[in-house]
Interface confidence: low
């Protein structure tokens, strides 16, 4: 339905508070280097303009598209060329090319300082002094570091952030109350950002069809009692929401997400029995709750899939009449019967089924040709099952830190050209699959593990895309979205890699390591481990373990010494010499 003024429409739908927050997120995600105060000024100007349009939709410029209004506003930033370089050229373009240009310049790894958490009393004072500015700053800092963060979900995080400070700043022990909550929000926020980044990559790199297939599989697992038509409607609406958010249309995205939540709750009887509690919550909590809701129970006595998709004489006729609908039905029927499979496995099965029909429906005897199609699924199912079993056994044997180290070595040997910080970040996250998923029973392990690995490997893909250094990474990232994990799993040691020159400076450590948190100390050690492998890709597990054990002992010893810096200097030289000898460097 057309509105005379799009900006007035969205302002009225969303309300002033959400409107301002979403515009701030949009601007911070586009201009990631701009100071907070500049963004606040731009947001206030846009908000005042929106209010004039609410008062009179025929007022000057009120009929312009949101992209035009927001793009014009962003292009008024004085320091655009100095701060952003060629991104300033976007401003010479017309819509819709200008917005596409801004999107292409979003930086997944912006050169921004790490967010350091101030003392609790300092944070509480800032919160009490100016709550509104404090919360806006949270939105700004998260949005600029995570330019694809799902904007309506960020509003939900901000609400929880506010609630944490409201509760804890008046608690007897502020730190004990607040810090676990902030840790939880940080960890959940990183996970949410990474999950959304995969959705956007799916849409932008592989197209709407790929995203819709993912959504059919996931929603069919979650809502197995819903009819195919109902699932299809939800998929269409969900695709619109994520297309908008990934495209920077955050006001439309938030508005449409609210409409979708409303629809789901009004029709929960035909969707899922698990939605009741979610639907009693306020809007932001409701949308989050629906997105995370547990799978409904499978309907009893579902018939065999073979009848409709293998034994029926109409398979090729049905396929020819409406290929995507028929494949969608296959995916829906398979997924609702298999909450124990990962979404990517279900998509691989659907792709195998599609390839078989493409071949067989052109054959002399189609039925004879596709009769054994389900037999082709067996190895596809067993591959992730076996991989998860092996890796969970390894995780349970080693614990998280050493499991991460095993993955660091494995992935550095596969793709040694990738930057050390990226290898450390990605391997640490890959290693977290153990604590996240291995505790689950068999039936929940695969969807937990393989779909999580898809999210983490997408981080590798988007970081690598910014500065491509490895043809192998490019190949695994671009050939097939659903086969990324098997592609990386199948990579062996890169025999073409020329080992890095040994640089003693890389292995020189100072007393500051002693004051680091356990996590930061682990990262230092893991960085050294990656560098070791880059110098000596053929080093055995035993050799690397010996060097890392020596390194841990060295750090522990020097951190206990009276003169720490001297200890690090003298013992460090000995360690480097011993390591070189041990590895034959």
């Amino acid at each position: 339905d057309a509105h005379k003024s799009e900006v007035a429409h969205r302002f009225k739908d969303l309300g002033e508070e959400n409107f301002k927050a979403l515009v701030l997120i949009a601007f911070a995600q586009y201009l990631q280097q701009c100071p907070f105060e500049d963004h606040v000024k731009l947001v206030n100007e846009v908000t005042e303009f929106a209010k004039t349009c609410v008062a009179d939709e025929s007022a000057e410029n009120c009929d312009k598209s949101l992209h035009t209004l927001f793009g014009d506003k962003l292009c008024t930033v004085a320091t655009l060329r100095e701060t952003y370089g060629e991104m300033a050229d976007c401003c010479a373009k017309q819509e819709p090319e200008r917005n596409e240009c801004f999107l292409q310049h979003k930086d997944d790894n912006p050169n921004l300082p790490r967010l350091v958490r101030p003392e609790v009393d300092v944070m509480c004072t800032a919160f009490h002094d100016n709550e509104e500015t404090f919360l806006k700053k949270y939105l700004y800092e998260i949005a600029r570091r995570h330019p694809y963060f799902y904007a309506p979900e960020l509003l939900f995080f901000a609400k929880r952030y506010k609630a944490a400070f409201t509760e804890c700043c008046q608690a007897a022990d502020k730190a004990a109350c607040l810090l676990p909550k902030l840790d939880e929000l940080r960890d959940e926020g990183k996970a949410s950002s990474a999950k959304q980044r995969l959705k956007c990559a799916s849409l932008q790199k592989f197209g709407e069809r790929a995203f819709k297939a993912w959504a059919v599989a996931r929603l069919s697992q979650r809502f197995p009692k819903a009819e195919f038509a109902e699932v299809s409607k939800l998929v269409t609406d969900l695709t619109k929401v994520h297309t908008e958010c990934c495209h920077g249309d955050l006001l439309e995205c938030a508005d449409d997400r609210a409409d979708l939540a409303k629809y789901i709750c009004e029709n929960q009887d035909s969707i899922s029995s698990k939605l009741k509690e979610c639907c009693e919550k306020p809007l932001l909590e409701k949308s989050h709750c629906i997105a995370e809701v547990e799978n409904d129970e499978m309907p009893a006595d579902l018939p065999s899939l073979a009848a409709d998709f293998v034994e029926s004489k109409d398979v090729c006729k049905n396929y020819a009449e409406a290929k995507d609908v028929f494949l969608g039905m296959f995916l829906y029927e398979y997924a609702r019967r298999h909450p124990d499979y990962s979404v990517v496995l279900l998509l691989r099965l659907a792709k195998t089924y599609e390839t078989t029909l493409e071949k067989c429906c052109a054959a002399a005897d189609p039925h004879e040709c596709y009769a054994k199609v389900f037999d082709e699924f067996k190895p596809l199912v067993e591959e992730p099952q076996n991989l998860i079993k092996q890796n969970c056994e390894l995780f349970e044997q080693l614990g998280e830190y050493k499991f991460q180290n095993a993955l660091l070595v494995r992935y550095t040997k596969k793709v040694p050209q990738v930057s050390t910080p990226t290898l450390v970040e990605v391997s640490r996250n890959l290693g977290k699959v153990g604590s996240k998923c291995c505790k689950h029973p068999e039936a929940k392990r695969m969807p937990c593990a393989e779909d999580y690995l898809s999210v983490v490997l997408n981080q590798l893909c988007v970081l690598h895309e910014k500065t491509p250094v490895s043809d192998r990474v490019t190949k695994c990232c671009t050939e097939s979205l659903v086969n990324r994990r098997p592609c990386f799993s199948a990579l062996e040691v890169d025999e073409t890699y020329v080992p890095k020159e040994f640089n003693a400076e890389t292995f020189t450590f100072h007393a500051d390591i002693c004051t680091l948190s356990e996590k930061e100390r682990q990262i230092k050690k893991q960085t050294a481990l990656v560098e070791l492998v880059k110098h000596k890709p053929k080093a055995t597990k035993e050799q690397l373990k010996a060097v890392m054990d020596d390194f841990a002992a060295f750090v522990e010893k020097c951190c206990k010494a009276d003169d720490k810096e001297t200890c690090f200097a003298e013992e460090g030289k000995k360690l480097v010499a011993a390591s070189q000898a041990a590895l034959g460097l």
Partner: nanobody, 115 residues
Framework: EVQLVESGGGLVQPGGSLRLSCAAS????????MSWVRQAPGKGLEWVSA????????RYAESVKGRFTISRDNSKNTLYLQMNSLRAEDTAVYYC????????GGQGTTVTVSS
């Protein structure tokens, strides 16, 4: 199925002691950090203490430091909380949980400190 069963709560006078236990099953206990959290009547969940998977690293909320000791026995899949010098404000339902999230684990065990 992950299960956490807390026990050892009860009524105790101010200054007294209690030892809480948490029996874990359904996951590899020795691979995970564990925490105790508590919920006083009419209040939200409060994080009390945490311990890493091997038992070497322990953390405490300021309000219990020096009075409570967290420990674990990985061979028995059990987490413990030794509570000494109990005060009225320690009255709460105590839960053990995987990791360091301030979320409930099992059914909890009630500790009442009153004279």
């Amino acid at each position: 199925e992950v299960q956490l069963v807390e026990s050892g709560g009860g009524l105790v006078q101010p200054g007294g002691s209690l030892r809480l236990s948490c029996a874990a099953s359904g996951f590899t206990f020795g691979s995970f950090g564990m925490s105790w959290v508590r919920q006083a009547p009419g209040k939200g969940l409060e994080w009390v203490s945490a311990i890493d998977s091997g038992g070497a690293d322990t953390r405490y909320a300021e309000s219990v430091k020096g009075r409570f000791t967290i420990s674990r026995d990985n061979s028995k899949n059990t987490l413990y909380l030794q509570m000494n010098s109990l005060r009225a404000e320690d009255t709460a339902v105590y839960y053990c949980t995987i990791g360091r999230s301030a979320s409930r684990g099992g059914q909890g065990t009630t500790v009442t400190v009153s004279s």
